[in-house]
């Protein structure tokens, strides 16, 4: 267990950056920061959780930007950002620092937020080391910060996995070695016997290997199947693996902020009330009370004090804190070439000519729901429709009465007569056929087209 600490030194335009604020003349505002820690050095998806923890800073002092003045370093929130970690410090991690700007003017729906800068660093860092300084550029902005990881007693080591006992917790008892001087600090860890389990063993003298409760063997590798020592306190015996009575780690209740203490093998554990974290419940974590959900997001707390909050985002926003506006037009919701407009509260589609509907889904030129009059049939094609009209009718929807003889359909001087079912041609002498198209030869045989395959001359023939 331990705490990752981040100190922001300055945030402002970098060298060669914008000479004046890119957010000028927009009224009073203030800065705050969000830090997110992810384990490992691999590039993680932006939406992957901050598995090592996250923290939100307090809001900084209110400032009003001057339109013509050069943008100075902006006023920062006070204090460290602290991200408690319960388990081992991984050593390699991704650090994401977001700088947010909160506008305090008259905003619809309350304050408005905008993400000014986000820096991501993949780093190796040992716990217990000195502060590491960094300068990062994000667009025109420059962020200067320092960070470190520190263990919380009794955890020590570069990964905060070794446990030691503060000397002041030592009490002499019959048969135990003389007490070390009373000092509220850990003894320098002695070099244990080679191979002594880092997890289940410890030593108070160089070369020894003493086991935590539940483990035995020369290197503390063997689990104790049945322990008759449960409930006893003190360092374990090298011979039996049992604990010698001693002081309780919960004596004096080391848990702050109303945390309750329970003993664990060789140490203690604090059960913290909601909103507090850390080995001794001394670190306040991000909870719904911190207002971590932006843009109208609703903060939904977990079912128990240890579970993280989640933000349910209003339509149009996403991200773990509802900080990202959804580009809803990127999903191309408008069909048939319609133009998408994201109005914030709703999407609008501006449809091309010939299309309609909320998503331009209705083709005004198609046959669906469109009837051709007077027995005509609708034929689709090429994004448009046309009516194939019954004889005697014409026009776009077959609503116009047509004169079937207007196009002079009878060939070779034939006379055209309009009839209820169409037209009839009265052919001039020497011609025959529905349209008087076939000349009659002198021998009385008409010049009909060749018979289709399979028909013998003289069979009855029908022609359209």
């Amino acid at each position: 267990a331990g705490v990752f600490e981040l100190q922001i030194h300055s945030f402002g335009p970098g060298p060669g950056g914008a000479p004046r604020s890119p957010y000028s003349a927009r009224g009073p505002c203030r800065l705050f920061f969000r830090v997110c820690l992810k384990p490992g050095l691999s590039e993680e998806a932006a939406e992957s959780p901050c598995a090592l923890g996250a923290a939100l800073s307090a809001r900084g002092p209110v400032y009003t930007e001057q339109p013509e003045a050069p943008a100075p370093d902006l006023p920062l929130p006070n204090g460290l950002l602290q991200v408690p970690f319960r388990d081992a410090w991984p050593g390699t991690f991704s650090l994401i620092i977001e700088t947010w700007r909160e506008e305090l003017g008259d905003q619809i729906g309350g304050p408005a937020w905008s993400l000014l800068a986000r820096v991501t660093r993949r780093r190796r860092l040992a716990a217990g080391g000195p502060w590491a300084g960094d300068i990062q550029r994000a667009g025109a902005w420059e962020l200067r910060f320092s960070y470190r990881a520190r263990c919380e007693l009794p955890a020590v080591g570069t990964a905060c996995t070794r446990l030691c006992r503060p000397r002041s917790a030592s009490r002499c008892g019959p048969g135990l070695r003389p007490c070390a001087p009373l000092e509220d600090e850990c003894e320098a860890p002695p070099v244990c016997r080679a191979g002594c389990s880092l997890e289940h063993g410890f030593c108070e003298q160089p070369g020894e290997c003493r086991c935590l409760e539940g483990w035995t063997g020369p290197l503390c590798m063997v689990p104790v199947s049945t322990s008759s020592c449960l409930g006893l306190r003190g360092p374990s015996s090298t011979t039996t693996g049992c604990l010698v009575p001693g002081p309780g780690p919960c004596d004096g209740n080391p848990c702050a902020n109303g945390g309750s203490c329970s003993e664990t093998p060789g140490s203690f554990e604090c059960t913290c009330p909601r909103g507090f974290y850390g080995l001794r419940c001394e670190v306040s974590g991000v909870t719904c009370a911190d207002g971590p959900c932006f843009n109208g997001g609703l903060c939904v707390g977990g079912a128990d004090p240890d579970s993280a909050y989640i933000c349910h985002c209003p339509p149009g926003f996403q991200g773990s804190n509802c900080e990202k506006r959804v580009d809803r037009c990127s999903l191309q919701p408008c069909r048939n070439g319609g133009l998408c407009l994201d109005l914030g509260h709703a999407l609008r589609c501006r449809c091309r000519a010939g299309f309609a509907g909320p998503r331009c889904e209705h083709d005004l030129n198609d046959c669906a729901g469109r009837a051709c009059a007077n027995g005509g049939t609708c034929v689709e094609g090429g994004g448009a429709h046309r009516c194939s009209c019954a004889l005697g009718f014409g026009g776009r929807d077959c609503r116009e009465r047509a004169d079937p003889c207007a196009a002079r359909p009878c060939a070779h001087g034939g006379r055209c007569y309009a009839h209820f079912s169409g037209l009839v041609c009265a052919c001039a002498p020497g011609y025959m056929g529905a349209r008087c198209e076939f000349p009659v030869h002198p021998d009385g045989v008409s010049a009909l087209p060749a018979a289709p395959p399979g028909l013998r001359p003289g069979d009855p023939q029908r022609y359209p």
Epitope: I108, C288, G296, C299, G301, P314, H345
Partner: antibody, heavy 118, light 108 residues
Framework: QVQLQESGPGLVKPSETLSLTCTVS????????WSWIRQPPGKGLEWIGY???????NYNPSLKSRVTISLDTSKNQFSLKLSSVTAADTAVYYC????????????WGQGTLVTVSS | EIVLTQSPGTLSLSPGERATLSCRAS???????LAWYQQKPGQAPRLLIY???SRATGIPDRFSGSGSGTDFTLTISRLEPEDFAVYYC?????????FGGGTKVEIK
């Protein structure tokens, strides 16, 4: 203009399940959160829960063990089921749409009175 | 959960007077995520204000909201006859969503 209409039995027996449906007209059920709120006679408003068109739900912890809200996008409807009802569940039940700028209620149904009695 | 306490329980005023309704939260309401509703007998509530101070569509400008943190106010600058009703506040920053107990504005 979005309109919401609650429907369902006005009388439910104790220990049974109360079932109500809200039909949304004048707009799509997609892209919004939809909620149920109730008001016992002569008393104040109590939020029951909501559902997002994607299926996300959130319920009032005081009712969570008994509440289910579901969605039927094809019918533009969402529903409330409240199990093991008692006389204390007698109330006017409202369905409502949650706003675009936060979790307030911008459109409401006219409400339906459900009486729990044997 | 965040408990909202409205005061007074009943406000007796005459048309034309100014009404000031209070809503106090048991803990800070994040980012002024607070709404006000009006409810008349036999009707559903109607949204008046969201974001503590933004008027909903179609709401007359005699209605105004203010406040932040734990203290919020709804003001009706000049009461019209149709304004006599029950008014509720609601916070929507932290789940569960909660309403105040209501303030009844009645004709004196």
């Amino acid at each position: 203009q979005v309109q919401l209409q609650e429907s369902g039995p006005g009388l439910v027996k104790p220990s049974e399940t109360l079932s109500l449906t809200c039909t949304v007209s004048g707009g799509s059920i997609n892209s919004y959160y939809w909620s149920w709120i109730r008001q016992p006679p002569g008393k104040g408003l109590e939020w029951i829960g909501y559902i997002f068109y994607s299926g996300i739900t959130n319920y009032n912890p005081s009712l969570k063990s008994r509440v289910t809200i579901s969605l039927d996008t094809s019918k533009n409807q969402f529903s409330l089921k409240l199990s093991s009802v008692t006389a204390a569940d007698t109330a006017v039940y409202y369905c409502a749409r949650i706003g675009v700028a936060g979790f307030y209620f911008d459109y409401w149904g006219q409400g339906t009175l459900v009486t729990v009695s044997s | 959960e965040i408990v909202l306490t409205q005061s007074p329980g009943t406000l007796s005023l005459s048309p034309g007077e100014r009404a000031t309704l209070s809503c106090r939260a048991s803990q800070s309401v994040s980012s002024s995520y607070l709404a006000w509703y009006q409810q008349k007998p036999g009707q559903a509530p109607r949204l008046l204000i969201y974001g503590a101070s933004s008027r909903a569509t179609g709401i007359p400008d005699r209605f105004s909201g203010s406040g932040s943190g734990t203290d919020f106010t709804l003001t009706i600058s000049r009461l019209e006859p149709e304004d006599f009703a029950v008014y509720y506040c609601q916070q929507y920053g932290t789940s569960p969503l909660t309403f105040g107990g209501g303030t009844k504005v009645e004709i004196k």
